[in-house]
């Protein structure tokens, strides 16, 4: 019988008695930075090459006995999860192991850095196919470790790391907090976040997705045919490293940005019980459980987008928060969110030659988040068109006036502290989908893009009575690029995209009362690329 | 995910470039920063990663490391260069007393210094 974790990541069309999806990652090399491993275990024999790299601190305590099986336990299990014959995800992947953790599972930032440098030098000396680096370890936030990961990622290496087992915000740990790394949290057979003793999986905006990480059967270093159950975000990260190896083997030219977008796209959505997470982290934590794509080819036609949350701005009056997309991604829209509702909106602005999303806190506000919608749009030419506050009763409006440019997102930003408290709502004139409409005292920013075959449409969902949440989703074949609230609703806390759904959040209705401004309208901009679809059909 | 200027403990030692007769003083107005792990039990004081500015060559890294050793020796401190980084980040790993941090932060090409810390299997 197939172990639960392999069943969970396998799409139904692969599910037979045996887990044998096509091509087991044979074109990919996976580097494992962990403990020593038992390379002659029957699960991984001939699949894992033990490098001569070793950089570990001495074991703590005078009573510590160096037992080979204990020393190899963690690394052997993970190597088995990635590429094991019986219980592995990518059975064809070849692996190389570097020892950066001692027999107690402890290492140093410096030892890990030297290990990453070793991988980069190996890559330069003998370039091979796609590389995946698995970092099943965590320490406190480290600027230097994150910087090293960034450099390696920019050299074309896919890094996958454990979110951490501290039941805490993953952004407080490294390498989990490095934006370029794919950070993985752990879920169990019930798709619940994993509890480990008094702690459990980390969470928050620095987690990219979750994967099976509890009661995972894999190679045991106790003997060459032994198996054991282990748990943790390391096991979850190993699943994603295996999935990444499978995807890269099928499409070796995939960039890190493309791989991350695909991992997110093919994940199971909204299956995790968010009540396990602290209340303030629920909105920031992705409700995604990793899975293999249903077919290894043909995903290229899709317009892929993901949501990136900024760090919290902090409560000072002029505080801002910035959300950034990866270098290969386009920022197609920008929104903001504040739990107190006190914010001064958001705007897209250029920074270092790239657009970023900046949200502004308001006086008395507890702080804001900026939310970027980051998409893969080849040959795109995007720009931001801004209209200053109109001061006219009809409100501020801006549209995409360049030929061939389509509207992908709307943002609004205002200087006044309490926008629209006593102002009537402003409604968009019908039949003008290519423009953004905002409050008369706000400046409005339209994200306008030109890309081959790109088409977009606006979809709205309005609710006349006050409601804590209003949503509008894009239909099958269309991808959500923009999410905002129609102006005039002063009690709106903000808007953000969850997968293909635009969510507009309002204050607790009990405190607002049902007035004319109780009406809340969520506005989604849904796009698709005919060019990508055609290119995909030509390939097939 | 976390920006580089995000949530972690940063100890900024804003130091001017009046170091004793440095041939290559840092550019005016720039100050190197010192970082350490916010989780105290995970700190490993006595070992530091000295990260140099992005375009620094290996030869400059080695020269900077030697300079630190020489200046430390003049003050009666023993230091050991454990590793010189190149390929990913320019810099070096040094075993030294925390007393020398002010001195190290004034060295040419230094971007920031981070105290070593523990990582754990997850």
């Amino acid at each position: 019988s197939i172990p639960w974790n392999l069943e969970r990541i396998t799409p139904p069309r692969y599910r037979a008695d045996e887990y044998q999806p096509p091509d087991g990652g044979s074109l990919v090399e996976v580097y494992l930075l962990d403990t020593s491993i038992q390379s002659d275990h029957r699960e991984i024999e001939g699949r894992v090459m033990v490098t001569d790299f070793e950089n570990v601190p001495e074991e703590d305590g005078t009573r510590f006995h160096r037992q080979a099986s204990k020393c190899d336990s963690h690394g052997t299990h993970l190597a088995g999860v990635v590429s094991g014959r019986d219980a592995g995800v990518a059975k064809g992947a070849s692996m190389r192991s570097l020892r950066v953790l001692n027999c107690q599972g402890k290492g140093t930032v410096s030892g890990t850095l030297i290990g990453l440098e070793f991988i980069r030098k190996s890559q330069l000396v003998q370039p091979v196919g796609p590389l995946v680096v698995l970092l099943p370890l965590a320490g406190g936030y480290s600027r230097v470790l994150n910087a090293a990961c960034q450099r390696l990622a920019r050299a074309g290496v896919v890094l996958v790391t454990a979110a951490g087992n501290f039941r805490d915000d993953a952004c407080l740990y490294s390498p989990a907090s490095a934006p370029e790394v794919i950070t993985v949290g752990a879920t169990n057979a019930q798709d619940q976040p994993v509890t480990l003793g008094t702690l459990g999986t980390n969470f928050g905006r620095c987690v990219d997705l979750f994967a099976p990480g509890e009661d995972i059967i894999g190679a045991s270093s106790d003997c060459s045919t032994c198996f054991v159950s282990q748990s943790g975000t390391s096991q979850a990260a190993a699943h994603v490293a295996g999935i990444a190896a499978m995807m890269l083997s099928a499409e070796p030219e995939l960039t890190l940005a493309e791989l991350r977008q695909r991992l997110i796209h093919f994940s199971a959505k909204d299956v995790i019980n968010e009540a396990w997470f602290p209340e303030d982290q629920r909105v920031l934590t992705p409700n995604l459980v990793a899975a293999l794509p249903p077919s290894t080819h043909g995903a290229g036609w899709q317009l892929f987008c993901r949501t990136v949350w900024s760090a919290h701005s902090g409560p000072t009056r002029m505080a801002t928060a910035v959300a950034r997309c990866a270098p290969d991604e386009e920022l197609l829209s920008c929104s903001s969110f504040s739990r107190s509702g006190k914010r001064r909106g958001e705007r897209m602005e250029a920074q270092g030659g790239k657009l970023v999303c900046r949200a502004h806190n308001a006086f008395g506000g507890e702080g804001v988040y900026a939310i970027a919608r980051c998409c893969l749009l080849p040959q795109a030419n995007c720009s931001v068109h801004t209209a200053p506050p109109a001061e006219a009763s009809m409100g501020t409006r801006v549209h995409c006036h360049q030929q061939g440019h389509v509207l992908t997102g709307c943002s609004s930003h205002w200087e006044v502290e309490d926008l629209g408290t006593h102002k009537p709502p402003v409604l968009r004139p019908r039949g003008q989908p290519n423009q953004c409409v905002g409050h008369r005292e706000a400046s409005i920013h339209a994200s306008c893009c030109h890309a081959p075959g790109l088409e977009c449409k606006v979809k709205e969902h309005g609710i006349p009575a006050p409601q804590e949440q209003v949503t509008v989703a894009c239909e099958e074949g269309w991808t959500l690029t923009g999410c905002s609230a129609l102006p005039g609703t002063s009690h709106v806390l903000g808007a953000y995209a969850v997968d293909n759904t635009c969510v507009v959040r309002s204050r607790d209705v009990s405190t607002t009362g049902s007035t004319s401004e109780g009406a809340v309208t969520a506005v989604a901009i849904c796009c698709r690329s005919r060019h990508l679809a055609q290119a995909s059909q030509e390939l097939q | 995910q976390e920006d580089e200027d995000g949530d972690y403990e940063e100890l900024v030692l804003a130091l001017r470039s009046e170091e004793d007769g440095l041939a290559e003083a840092p550019e005016h107005g720039t100050t190197a920063t010192f970082h350490r792990c916010a989780k105290d039990p995970w700190r490993l004081p006595g070992t530091y990663v000295v990260v140099l500015k992005e375009e620094t060559h290996l030869s400059q890294s080695e020269r900077t490391a030697r300079r630190l050793q020489a200046q430390a020796a003049r003050r009666g401190y023993l230091t050991k260069i454990l590793h010189v980084f190149h390929g990913l980040l320019p810099g070096f790993l040094v075993k030294m007393s925390g007393d020398l941090l002010e001195l190290a932060l004034k060295l040419p090409h230094v971007d920031y210094i981070e105290e070593d810390s523990s990582v754990f299997a997850q």
């Epitope: 107690q104 059967i217 045991s220 106790d222 282990q230 748990s231 | -």
Partner: antibody, heavy 130, light 107 residues
Framework: EVQLVESGGGLVQPGGSLRLSCAAS????????MSWVRQAPGKGLEWVAN????????YYVDSVKGRFTISRDIAKNSLYLQMNSLRAEDTAVYYC???????????????????????WGQGTTVTVSS | DIQMTQSPSTLSASVGDRVTITCRAS??????LAWYQQKPGKAPKLLIY???SLESGVPSRFSGSGSGTEFTLTISSLQPDDFATYYC?????????FGQGTKLEIK
């Protein structure tokens, strides 16, 4: 689905010996600790012994120490209980059960998280009588 | 050795009732407690582990609580299929002990 099938029970005289076997299916057998649990007629459950995945650690209830030996053969996916010096009070239905548990790492140490005995055999009856 | 004491030994109840069974440990076992259900002539079945975690496939009317030395198993609304004997088991160390059992019968 993991299945456990016990065999080897029967009637034996006091002082005699018996060897119980438990056959398991799937690689999951070697992944967990395994236990023997017994139930005397009309009585409650009594844990007898358990054994680690690789057989390197074994534990017994006081009343059987020195008389019973638990062992396992990973190649054959089998668990055994060798019972010597049998007494009348050893009369019971003997179940083999999987001890589902998992290891996870703390900061510099391994921890064990135990879920309980989640898969049981149908039981084999041992009667000790003259 | 740690002793486990269940109460009551026998419990009579009707379909739809809410019932509670208690298990007391002779010393603290943190949350390392499991509950099992056994029907005549059958092997036991795991219901709850780590004092309060519901085993996969077990109906949500079963719940567990407690830590240290006092634990309870609650069935929120008795169904005909729930009449059986229930056992608690401690696993504070690698050697385990069961409670003497609580027989739940139809009133």
């Amino acid at each position: 689905e993991v299945q456990l099938v016990e065999s080897g029970g029967g009637l034996v005289q006091p002082g005699g010996s018996l060897r119980l076997s438990c056959a398991a299916s799937g690689i999951t057998f070697s992944s967990y600790w395994m236990s023997w649990v017994r139930q005397a007629p009309g009585k409650g459950l009594e844990w007898v012994a358990n054994i680690k995945q690789d057989g390197s650690e074994k534990y017994y209830v006081d009343s059987v120490k020195g008389r019973f030996t638990i062992s396992r053969d990973i190649a054959k996916n089998s668990l055994y209980l060798q019972m010597n010096s049998l007494r009348a009070e050893d009369t019971a239905v003997y179940y083999c059960a999987r001890d589902r548990g998992t290891y996870y790492t703390g900061m510099g140490e391994y921890n064990y998280y135990y879920y309980g005995m989640d898969v049981w055999g149908q039981g084999t009856t041992v009667t000790v009588s003259s | 050795d740690i002793q486990m004491t269940q109460s009551p030994s026998t419990l009579s109840a009707s379909v739809g009732d809410r019932v509670t069974i208690t298990c007391r440990a002779s010393q603290s076992i943190s949350s390392w407690l499991a509950w099992y259900q056994q029907k005549p002539g059958k092997a036991p079945k795991l219901l709850i582990y780590k004092a309060s975690s519901l085993e996969s496939g077990v109906p949500s009317r079963f719940s567990g609580s407690g830590s240290g030395t006092e634990f309870t198993l609650t069935i929120s609304s008795l169904q005909p299929d729930d009449f059986a004997t229930y056992y608690c088991q401690q696993y504070n160390s690698y050697s385990y002990t069961f409670g003497q059992g609580t027989k739940l019968e139809i009133k």
